[in-house]
């Protein structure tokens, strides 16, 4: 009788990670008794996979009932592939022997390769904001695909970006791969409502990349603008001034107002006016009561925003212009601040 | 699982037309659809694709003349203005499972024939 | 775009012989290979995909190899039912396009 080959039929099959892989192998004789094996790898370090006889092999089932008298068929399936799977699969015949089983024959091996998706890209932009004008870098990763080859592209409210560096790891072969990158872009004033992409494609991914995304708003601190403007009111001896608080962002913003540099009040700034590009404006004002100042006042508006360091605008009001009521000592009235469009 | 084209007929020079390939046995909402033609006696020329989500995707050379899109069962192909040269079988084919570097299902094709 | 070139464009070859084709990318794809059998009036059949692994229900006798630039489809035995035009069909990762060369007919000798 032919002596027992053990015959793989697929040199190589390719699974897509979460699917199950059926790894064929049949023997052409019963003679000689003894169990089959399945193993990744070869030699000494090889991994065992799958044994006939005993443990416990939780994602591999056997395709046909290994416990029929004149079976032939060893193919086995796992289930959940995932891109560690990888490797090169022997089915191992062996031949009883006591106290151990001695290897007989190797079927050629089943190379099995896993194709994986990439993850989802994850934007990351800087810790702190920035300021028009100013550069910023924003990373994007993507881990656990397979194969390799992957590309990335980054966009600016749908403009391609071309400053950029992309790494993909590791360099050499590897069960699965990962991509880093990051951009450079310059920020505008009109950058509160932009976004920035990340756009991964992949052989796995059926037709339409993958992206991840970062808005500026979360990024960028447009600086105030300030004005400040006298206005005269009805009531003799008192002027409404204001401070006109214009393209900030984000809203944080306190304001105080300093009467020849003393503090009169300080505000935060609650009921704001949105403008198209997403920054703000606001408007405090201040009812100066004249006749309780002999010399000229210097009013100053001084705006403390999302943190940063006070900016301020000031404002001389001429007393010697208003007429004067003599024993007058009313503090300054009552400051009205309210929002109000520009 | 299959793929069938349909419409393929005798058009005249400078006229639309639009064939359709009808899917069956999966869900084109979970696979890239492709195009292509063969004109008599020539090789396989690849048109255009649509993603699992609807975006098209056209080789250079189509510049416009040709519209991809799809509904939940048909994908069609929109023939702006046709010339003689566009006379050929048009399939219709759907990616592997694995990944969109194959084709794994084709239709039989349907022939468009362009003649004044 | 990626050019493809086929060799021969036709061959007449005996039932049991082996066969090889080969395609030649203008530049490297990888293994992003196909091949495809085509019989008169008919659609084309995959063979072989990512240049080397074959398309379940595909005859052992049809093998693929190749990498970058270079790749080959063997017919280890022909036989009767093989006589056909054999397609190359690949994919650029970057462009995401597709590319089929011209195409090689193997007659009966």
């Known amino acids: 009788e032919e002596e027992l080959q053990v015959i793989q039929p697929d040199k190589s099959i390719s699974v897509a990670a979460g699917e199950s892989a059926t790894l064929h192998c049949t023997v052409t004789s019963l003679i000689p008794v003894g169990p089959i094996q399945w193993f990744r790898g070869a030699g000494p370090g090889r991994e065992l996979i799958y044994n006939q006889k005993e443990g416990h092999f939780p994602r591999v089932t056997t395709v046909s009932d290994l416990t029929k008298r004149n079976n032939m068929d060893f193919s086995i399936r796992i289930s959940n592939i995932t891109p560690a799977d990888a490797g090169t699969y022997y089915c191992v015949k062996f031949r009883k022997g006591s106290p151990d089983h001695v290897e007989f024959k190797s079927g050629a091996g089943t190379e099995l390769s896993v194709r994986a998706k990439p993850s989802a890209p994850v934007v990351s932009g800087p810790a702190a904001r920035a300021t028009p004008q100013h550069t910023v870098s924003f990373t994007c990763e993507s881990h656990g695909f397979s194969p390799r080859d992957i590309t990335l592209k980054w966009f600016k409210n749908g403009n391609e970006l071309s400053d950029f560096q992309t790494n993909v790891d590791p360099a050499g072969d590897s069960v699965s791969y990962s991509i880093h990158s990051t951009a450079k872009v310059v920020l505008t004033r009109e950058d509160v409502h932009s976004q920035v992409i990340c756009e991964v494609a992949h052989v796995t991914l059926q037709g339409d990349p993958l992206r991840g995304t970062a808005n500026l708003s979360e990024t960028i601190r447009v600086p105030p603008t300030l004005e400040v403007t006298q206005q005269p009111v009805r009531a003799e001896n008192q002027v409404n001034v204001t401070c006109q608080v214009r393209k900030f962002y984000p809203q944080r913003l306190q304001l105080t107002w300093l009467e020849n540099g003393n503090v009169s009040r300080t505000e935060t700034a609650s009921t704001l006016t949105e403008n198209k590009d997403g920054t703000y404006n606001w408007m405090s004002w201040l009812l100066v009561n004249v006749s309780a100042h002999r010399d000229d006042v210097k009013l100053t508006c001084q705006v403390e925003h999302d943190g940063q360091p006070a900016v301020s605008k000031s404002h001389d009001l001429k007393v010697s212009a208003h007429p004067k009521e003599q024993g007058s000592n009313t503090a300054p009235g009552p400051a009205l601040a309210s929002a109000a469009p520009l | 699982q299959s793929v069938e084209e349909s419409g393929g007929r005798l058009g005249q020079p400078g006229t639309p037309l639009t064939l359709s390939c009808t899917v069956s046995?999966?869900?084109?909402?979970?696979?890239?659809m492709g195009w292509f033609r063969q004109a008599p006696g020539k090789g396989l020329e690849y048109i255009g694709i649509?993603?699992?989500?609807?975006s098209p995707y056209y080789a250079s050379w189509v510049n416009g003349r040709f519209t991809i899109s799809k509904t939940s069962t048909t994908m069609d192909l929109k023939m702006n203005s046709l010339r003689s040269e566009d006379t050929a079988t048009y399939f219709c084919?759907?990616?592997?499972?694995?990944?969109?570097?194959?084709?794994?299902?084709w239709g039989p094709g349907t022939l468009v024939t362009v003649s004044s | 775009d990626i050019q493809m070139t086929q060799s021969p464009s036709s061959l007449s070859a005996s039932v049991g012989d082996r066969v090889t084709i080969t395609c030649r990318a203008s530049?490297?794809?990888?293994?992003?290979l196909a091949w495809y059998q085509q019989k008169p009036g008919k659609a084309p059949k995959l063979l072989i995909y990512?240049?080397?692994f074959l398309y379940s229900g595909v005859p052992s006798r049809f093998s693929g190899s190749g990498s970058g630039t270079d790749f080959t489809l063997t017919i280890s035995s022909l036989q009767p039912e093989d006589f056909a035009t054999y397609y190359c069909?690949?994919?650029?990762?970057?462009?995401?396009?597709?590319?089929f060369g011209q195409g090689t007919k193997v007659e009966i000798k």
């Open positions: 084919a759907r990616v592997g499972p694995l990944g969109v570097d194959y084709f794994n299902i």
């Open positions: 046995g999966f869900s084109l909402s979970s696979y890239v």
């Open positions: 649509i993603s699992s989500s609807g």
């Open positions: 530049q490297s794809i990888n293994s992003y």
């Open positions: 990512s240049a080397s």
């Open positions: 069909q690949s994919w650029h990762y970057i462009s995401r396009s597709y590319t």
